[in-house]
């Protein structure tokens, strides 16, 4: 029988007439235009809505934009457009909402022609009010407020001023002409770049990094020859342009740009690109775009000063320049990734990894489940996810893989088991221990979320006739039960939960349909009462993550530490609440030389773990050699791998070694080493 | 092969305590929950608790909070067992047994291997 | 705390017969359910776990079936061996047992 089908499902009883009493519509009473919607702060309740409206005139276009507020995670709705003034909103910057629960809100205002710049409506008190600011420029971005601090914002203008407000939003003041990409660092600090002839475009490798550390009072100019810059965890990357040619290689700072040190990746041309996957304080995942319109490339993983890098990923889907890749960071458990590679065949595959690159695997065949009829083995073939490349492509796949910090475990995806992604309709799938299991969850593709952090997952078909039918599972997907939650159906456009999985309160969007008009309008639903009592002791069970063999002394040893956890069991029905925190208890593991990487100089031969000296050093690792700084070049041939918490065990202590005397062998001569080092 | 062996039979007076221990060998004892049930005579079996050898994380039946306490050592891989303010109703074998395991969860798949049993009579 | 209710409590059979003991929790435990058979004097000795995996060891006549709230332990053909008391128990919940039943020949 298909999942949840089944007669003994654990039941929630008397579910209709509880959802009943907690279902709310609203209809908006203006156009279907488009609509977008912000939470303001964490816990509040306050959910921001702005519908547009453009109708496209002779001469130019006519907008009209509406804006509602909610306090109560949209259960109602107030049209509070009168604060902005009626003022038409520019979606494209769409609205920006202060870090944390700082309850800022600006809103970017379209203006006619003529005017001298910009206006912006400013909210510190979660949109209760606002404040029309005129701006002394037109912005080209959305307002980025500092981490840090709030009240400071900066923004660039259409003619490439960097504009800085420390009174959030009040003054503004231009601290910097011809800059072409603004960051904000930690402490309130900006990075960005700046052209000197041209344009940005005209420019690009000749850009100069600047930093101020005291918003514009000061700068200092911390590189040159820049293509571009990017943030990352503690690490602050720059592509630099090659002195001889036009290849370009990554260099990082672990010091705001104070000191910089060439990355050990291979440079790359003008047709090619670096990005950066994913990054945390410990490492980064660095992609490195193939030679050629190959749509692949090679992700690298790095040590802990972000400069010494293991090829991690072969092959590795990234269509070209800002195109799609499916690198997903499956946030339910440490150290988890998914992605997929695009094998000799030009077929798609997907690929996990469940130690942060270390290794990668094809993901397990879900119990119960047949191999497609493609497959070349029918009884050996593989998950494949469906995310970021399949709904650029158009395919039957309504959203991406989710997974959430506070629903320990949980991975829900569209899929397709057999040798490749298919381009047959999907189903949906979940995993409940970080991706190393999996259970077809749902028949065809559907929208999902996940509230009360695990333990309710909703659902709603992805169909183009009108819906009125919401699925929801209280043991993870296990068992489903269905809740019309309107009489009339509607055209279904998205499921919106507040971020962080801890709400109990689903609004599912749609326009209904008539004969002259078509109007917004949204459902929520609070899942309060199905939930009727606190979860407590006595519904939470014990869990080992990442256990693969209770036989090995060290079952659930990733990067050097096991987690146990604490998490609700499937047929306990009751609230995790709000308050929720995963309560989890780590410990350390004994180092083997898995917990170690290979240090610049030095390889793993295949099916070996000791690392092994290289015999002479070629391409980037040349390169590395000549221009990297001294003390980089002196090692024993390990580094821990980032983040990696093991004690005692194996400790592969031998002589250091000086790779300098490698640099001046006869690759180069001293002499030139020697000029070109810095 | 995995064996538990359970210390030897008890007798004791009512308000007194009893600890029961349980040695684990040819196995590894830390990965693997240890449950302790019990069985009056000519009655059915009685989940008492079990505990986690890594962090020592315990948990134990309603019917016994506050009187039962399981502790584990993981350097000699012995559980143990201590249940309090005895009364005659607490004759019975005791057992310890270890929870089977296939995947992260430790209680989910039945006890794999059993202790020979401890009897404990308790008697004024 | 979830209660199982196992039924028979006692049953009678020859050598060779099928014999079907049921055992019922008081809410959907899911596949979380293992049956043991325990001779007088001895340890209980694991057949079954997750309602239908058979235990490494165990002959095959044994089998489970059921999930959500009831469930099945089935002997197919009934061994001089096999004579003994049969326990279910449940391990979503606080684990609970089920009160046992004794087969015995008839």
């Known amino acids: 029988s298909a999942p949840g089908e089944d007669e003994e499902c654990g039941r929630v009883r008397d579910f209709v007439a509880k959802l009943a009493n907690n279902t709310h519509q609203h209809v908006f009473d203006d156009l279907r235009g488009s609509v977008s919607l912000s939470w303001v702060g964490d816990s509040t309740g306050v959910i921001l809505v702005l519908t547009t409206f453009h109708v496209p005139l002779v001469i130019m276009t006519f907008g009209q934009s509406k804006l509602y507020r909610s306090e109560d995670y949209g259960k109602n709705f107030k049209d509070i457009t009168d604060l902005i003034n009626n003022t038409f909103i520019r979606t494209e910057f769409g609205m920006a909402i202060g870090p944390e629960n700082s309850g800022k809100v600006v809103l970017t205002a379209e203006v006619s022609g003529g005017s001298r710049g910009g206006r912006i409506f400013r909210s510190s008190d979660f949109a209760k009010n606002f404040v029309q600011t005129d701006l002394p420029f037109h912005p080209l971005t959305q307002m980025m407020y500092s981490p840090q601090n709030s009240d400071y914002l900066l923004a660039l203008s259409t003619e490439n001023g960097l504009w800085v407000s420390k009174n959030f939003g009040g003054k503004w003041e231009e601290i910097h002409k011809a800059v072409c990409l603004a960051k904000w660092g930690s402490d309130n600090t900006i990075f960005f770049t700046t052209y000197a002839n041209g344009s940005c475009k005209a420019d690009l490798g000749a850009l100069e990094l600047w930093r101020t550390s005291d918003l514009g009072k000061s700068f200092k100019t911390i590189g040159v020859k820049i293509y571009s810059f990017g943030l990352g965890g503690r690490f602050l990357f720059a592509s630099v342009m090659a002195d001889k040619d036009t290849t370009r290689r990554i260099h990082v700072s672990t010091d705001q740009g104070d000191t910089w040190s060439m990355a050990q990746l291979p440079s790359v041309g003008q047709e090619q690109f670096y990005s950066i996957l994913a990054a945390n304080d410990d490492m980064v995942f660095m992609h490195v775009d193939e030679p050629g319109d190959t749509g692949f490339g090679t992700i690298f993983t790095s040590d802990d000063r972000g400069i010494v890098y293991s090829k991690s990923l072969d092959r590795h889907l990234y269509t070209t320049t800002g195109g799609e890749t499916d690198f997903t960071n499956v946030t339910s458990l440490r150290g988890v990734y998914i992605t997929s590679v695009l094998s000799e065949d030009n077929s798609i595959q997907t690929m996990i990894t469940f130690d942060q690159g270390g290794r990668w695997t094809h993901l397990r065949k879900p119990e119960n489940s047949e191999c497609a009829a493609t497959a070349k083995n029918k009884n050996e073939c593989s998950l494949h996810i469906h995310a970021s490349y399949s709904i650029s492509q158009k395919l039957n796949v309504p959203m991406a893989p989710l997974s959430e910090p506070n629903a320990v475990g949980i991975v829900i995806a569209h899929g397709s088991v057999g040798d490749a992604i298919s381009v047959m309709v999907p189903d949906v799938y979940i995993s409940d221990d970080g991706g190393y299991s999996w259970t077809k969850m749902l028949e065809g593709p559907h929208y999902y979320t996940i509230l009360d952090s695990g333990g309710i997952i909703v659902a709603i078909e992805h169909s183009s006739r009108p819906i009125n039918v919401i699925k929801f599972s209280t043991d993870e997907g296990q068992c489903w039960q269905t809740y019309t939650f309107t009489r009339d159906p509607i055209y279904f456009t998205g499921l919106a939960s507040e971020p962080g999985a801890r709400s109990m309160n689903i609004s599912i969007w749609g326009f209904t349909e008539s004969f002259l008009t078509s109007q917004w309008v949204s459902y929520t639903i609070d899942f309060k009462d199905i939930l009727e009592r606190n979860c407590e002791e006595k519904d939470y069970t014990i869990w080992l993550a990442h256990s693969t063999d209770p036989e090995d002394y060290e079952d659930g040893c990733i990067l050097g530490y096991k987690e146990q956890f604490l998490r609700l069991r499937k047929s306990s029905v009751c609230q995790n609440g709000r308050d929720y925190v995963v309560t989890k208890q780590p410990s350390i593991c004994l180092c083997s030389l898995e917990d170690f990487l290979c240090d610049f100089g030095y390889y793993r031969p295949e099916n070996d773990s000791k690392c092994v000296e290289q015999p002479e050093l070629k391409g980037h690792d040349l390169e590395f050699c000549l221009y990297g700084r001294e003390e980089h070049l002196t090692t024993n041939g390990y580094r821990k791998i980032p983040g990696d918490k093991c004690q005692g065990g194996v400790n592969p202590v031998r002589e250091v070694k000086d790779l300098k005397k490698k640099c001046t062998s006869n690759f180069l001569s001293p002499e030139k080493q020697n000029s070109k080092s810095n | 092969q995995v064996q538990l062996v359970q210390s030897g039979a008890e007798v004791k007076k009512p308000g007194s305590s009893v600890k029961v221990s349980c040695k684990a060998s040819g196995g590894t004892f830390r990965n693997y929950a240890i449950s302790w049930v019990r069985q009056a005579p000519g009655q059915g079996l009685e989940w008492m608790g079990g505990i986690i050898p890594i962090g020592g994380w315990a948990n134990y039946a309603q019917k016994f909070q506050g009187r039962v306490t399981i502790t584990a050592d993981e350097s000699t891989s012995t559980a143990y067992m201590e249940l309090s303010s005895l009364r005659s109703e607490d004759t019975a074998v005791y057992y310890c047994a270890r929870q089977g395991r296939k995947t992260g969860y430790y209680y989910y798949y039945g006890m794999d291997v059993w202790g020979q049993g401890t009897t404990v009579t308790v008697s004024s | 705390d979830i209660q199982m209710t196992q039924s028979p409590s006692t049953l009678s059979a020859s050598v060779g017969d099928r014999v079907t003991i049921t055992c019922r929790a008081s809410?959907?435990?899911?596949?979380?359910l293992a049956w043991y058979q325990q001779k007088p004097g001895k340890a209980p000795k694991l057949l079954i776990y997750?309602?239908?995996s058979l235990e490494s060891g165990v002959p095959s006549r044994f089998s489970g079936s059921g999930s959500g709230t009831e469930f099945t332990l089935t002997i197919s053909s009934l061994q001089p061996d096999d004579f003994a008391t049969y326990y279910c128990?449940?391990?979503?919940?606080?684990?609970?047992f089920g009160g046992g039943t004794k087969v015995e020949i008839k």
């Open positions: 997750k309602a239908s």
């Open positions: 809410q959907s435990i899911s596949s979380w």
């Open positions: 128990q449940q391990a979503d919940g606080h684990i609970t």
